[in-house]
Interface confidence: low
């Protein structure tokens, strides 16, 4: 499929001008190659009318130009003094006319309306309101006022001052007679339809002395704004329909076959399943404007989108609308990254997030998509050292591996962590990407004790058991804080006995804290990595208490877990007597008290080899 994109249809009137924008992927070659505009012939050829190399056909002499904007990846063809002879099929393209790097454009030039003398022209957008003003003389002040529409050869009554309203206008038209001082009546038509366009006649009086005024109503269908975005990237539709519809339900829909427009999202809570996890409808401003963000763009997202306002939350005749034609460029600069990551309860995931490598200094963010209230994405962590309170000790955003990718690690997984997450930066907003975390059946791979208590001034040894599948990985211990996880020295204690059917390649790696101080309290992670690519992690919380008896502590898997009645305070908010643990997604289910769960019982993410779009926590 050609990556060149432009308007499919351009409509204008004789004597007017058009401006046609064509988009291309802004690669180095494309930026400098020849751009052209040609007219397709009946036998299939395409005759150049204008090109970026200076050629202008005699048909276009003095009335057309072509301008390239290499930094935007666009070029613009302007054509003036249009005539009906200009109607036809054209191509805008790159390189040689016959090579196929082009886009088909249909140009339709129609004859201007043949208007009667003294005709007032009203040009109004579809769905909006028009007020047709009708002056009259004093002698007709007390006489019947009426508005007719010319249908073929005959005028058809639309509304009059005796109370008649044509059924086609019911509920959206009124006739206002101004105060006695003004010799004027007005007809106001709301929610304009395309079928309302045409010639109107307003009249005061019915005899030969009646006053008449001609009006021509042109109802404009909005020209779609062209939007050219990369596959896997994101798009934002900004919709400003005006303050008069500020309190009316808003929608974004995608045109399917014919006139159907399938709702993508609306303010009444409807959302198309295909956009689950990757769409936000931003809150409205006071003037009723709003925007819709769609991430993780797919080929099938391409098409015509309309935003509008209607009490039903969907497109109806007379809805004020805005339109966009979205083209999804498959020659994307955004790299493939897994769209699904799988982990097990108690385990972990490591998510790779792409960003624009030109913006390495931008702030990186990770947020959790929520479907409530038209979609929202509360931030969970950023690269500036901020972590949402309920995620302390189990979430970290790392700048590694760098060069266009950062890593997010989430451990102590529960079923409530399943969902859609967005990677984003404060730089290039087109580089928002979406990943779905799925929680699957299984046991964590890494085994660590539960929460551990250390004694002030003594030595603490905490074990982490690595199965043989990680024999070739670098194993580490680190202390978690808001800015990341600071590596600590650890000792390889030889093969682990924690795994059944696992050979000598399994490993027990211990963290030793000598002369424990209050500052040692906190979250510790053990994990595996390969170079700058992180795999699975497991977390353990170390509490520090006063000395009771001398000696050092060597914690085993069995004895480190908190007893059911033991009071354990940690930054995951394990509550007294294990009654409730603060859960980051508590309000998603509107529970009164969260379920008890083990805070730190190891980590694992499985790798699903069935799809290149899926990633496990240790897929490296």
């Amino acid at each position: 499929k050609s990556p060149i994109f432009g308007p499919e249809e351009v409509n204008s009137v004789e004597g007017n001008s058009v401006s046609i924008t064509c988009y291309y992927p802004p690669t180095s070659v494309n930026r400098h190659t020849r751009k052209y505009w040609c007219r397709q012939g009946a036998r299939g050829g395409c005759i150049t009318l204008i090109s970026s190399e200076g050629y202008v056909s005699s048909k276009y002499a003095g009335r057309a130009n072509l301008t390239n904007f290499p930094e935007n990846g666009t070029f613009v063809v302007n054509i003036a003094q249009l005539s009906q002879d200009d109607s036809g099929r054209y191509k805008c393209g790159l390189g040689i006319n016959s090579r196929g790097l082009s886009f088909d454009v249909s140009l339709e030039v129609s004859q201007g309306p043949g208007l009667l003398n003294d005709t007032k022209v009203y040009t109004v957008d579809l769905g909006r309101t028009v007020t047709i003003n009708c002056p009259f003389k004093t002698e007709n002040a007390q006489k019947r006022k009426s508005l007719y529409k010319q249908i073929g050869l005959y005028p058809v009554l639309v509304i009059d001052s005796s109370g008649y309203v044509n059924p086609n206008y019911t509920g959206r038209i009124r006739l206002d007679i101004q105060g006695t001082g003004q010799l004027l009546f007005s007809v106001v038509i709301n929610q304009l339809r395309l079928s309302d366009a045409g010639q109107y006649l307003c009249q005061a009086g019915d005899d030969s002395n009646s006053n008449k005024k001609n009006a021509d109503l042109q109802v404009l269908k909005p020209e779609p704004e062209l939007v050219y975005e990369d596959l896997r990237g994101s798009v934002t539709f900004h919709c400003a329909l005006g303050p008069e519809v500020a309190n009316v339900a808003k929608f974004l829909c995608r045109q399917s076959s014919g006139e159907n427009c399938d709702v993508v999202v609306n303010t009444l809570g409807k959302r198309a399943p295909a956009f689950e996890g990757r769409i936000l409808l931003n809150p409205q401003d006071k003037d009723g404007s709003f925007s819709v963000v769609i991430t993780g763009l797919r080929k099938e997202d391409a098409g015509r989108y309309l935003c509008g306002a209607h009490s039903d939350g969907q497109l109806q005749e007379g809805s004020p609308i805005q339109a966009w034609q979205l083209f999804v460029n498959e020659e994307s600069t955004i790299p493939r990254s897994p769209t699904v990551v799988k982990g097990v309860a108690g385990g972990s995931v490591a998510v790779l997030c792409p960003y624009n490598r030109k913006e390495s200094k931008s702030i990186k963010y990770w947020c959790l998509w929520e479907g409530a209230q038209n979609g929202r994405c509360p931030l969970l962590v950023d690269s500036e050292g901020w972590v949402k309170a309920q995620y302390e000790g189990r979430l970290s955003l790392l700048e590694e591996p760098g060069n266009g990718t950062f890593t997010v690690i989430l451990n102590q997984l529960t079923s409530r962590d399943a969902g859609f997450y967005w990677c984003l930066t404060n730089g290039d907003t087109l580089w928002r990407t979406t990943v779905e975390i799925k929680i699957i059946e299984g046991e964590p791979n890494l085994k660590v004790p539960g929460n551990v208590t250390a004694v002030l001034g003594e030595t603490l040894k905490v074990p982490c058991h690595f199965p043989c599948k990680f024999s070739s990985y670098e194993k580490y211990w680190c202390k978690w804080n808001n800015t990341g996880c600071q590596a600590l020295p650890s000792q390889d204690e030889g093969p682990s006995k924690a795994f059944v059917n696992c050979d000598e390649n399994s490993r027990l790696v211990s963290l030793t804290l000598n002369l424990v101080t209050r500052a040692d309290e906190g979250w510790y992670w053990c994990g595996v990595k390969q170079g700058h690519f992180y795999g699975e992690t497991a977390a353990v919380y170390v509490a520090v208490e006063e000395r009771k008896a001398a000696g050092s502590r060597d914690v085993s898997l069995a004895k480190a877990d908190a007893a059911p009645d033991e009071k354990v305070l940690d930054s995951g908010f394990r509550e007294i007597e294990n009654k409730a643990i603060q859960d980051p997604r508590l309000f998603a289910e509107e529970k009164a008290v969260a379920d008890t769960r083990d805070q730190a019982d190891g980590s694992r993410a499985s790798v699903d080899s069935g799809s290149s779009e899926e990633q496990g926590g240790s897929s490296r």
Partner: nanobody, 124 residues
Amino acid sequence: EVQLVESGGGLVQAGGSLRLSCAASGSILSTNDMGWYRQAPGNQRELVARISRGSSTIYTESVKGRFTISRDNAKNTVYLQMNSLKPEDTAVYYCNADMLPSDLSHGYYYRDYWGQGTQVTVSS
């Protein structure tokens, strides 16, 4: 700049009552969950109570039946009514809110903000 300002703390005798307030100031489009946390000397900060935008609530076990959290969405304010106070309730109380500031140029992303804290001392 978005800020949370707490008020209502002070010294009270055991069995007494206090009402804490926390108001958000600055340019805010929307407020999501709001809550109160506390930190006693030598302890970690712990959840006291949280309230969702739809007014669903959660309390830590030790304050259930004594403390009530409420909110006024129009004023972006959260309250904590504390009755039957005990000496072990002595702590610095922090307000926390998940808010969408209107100056977030890069999109529609809530993040949480913390107040400076207000001291509550319960004497026996």
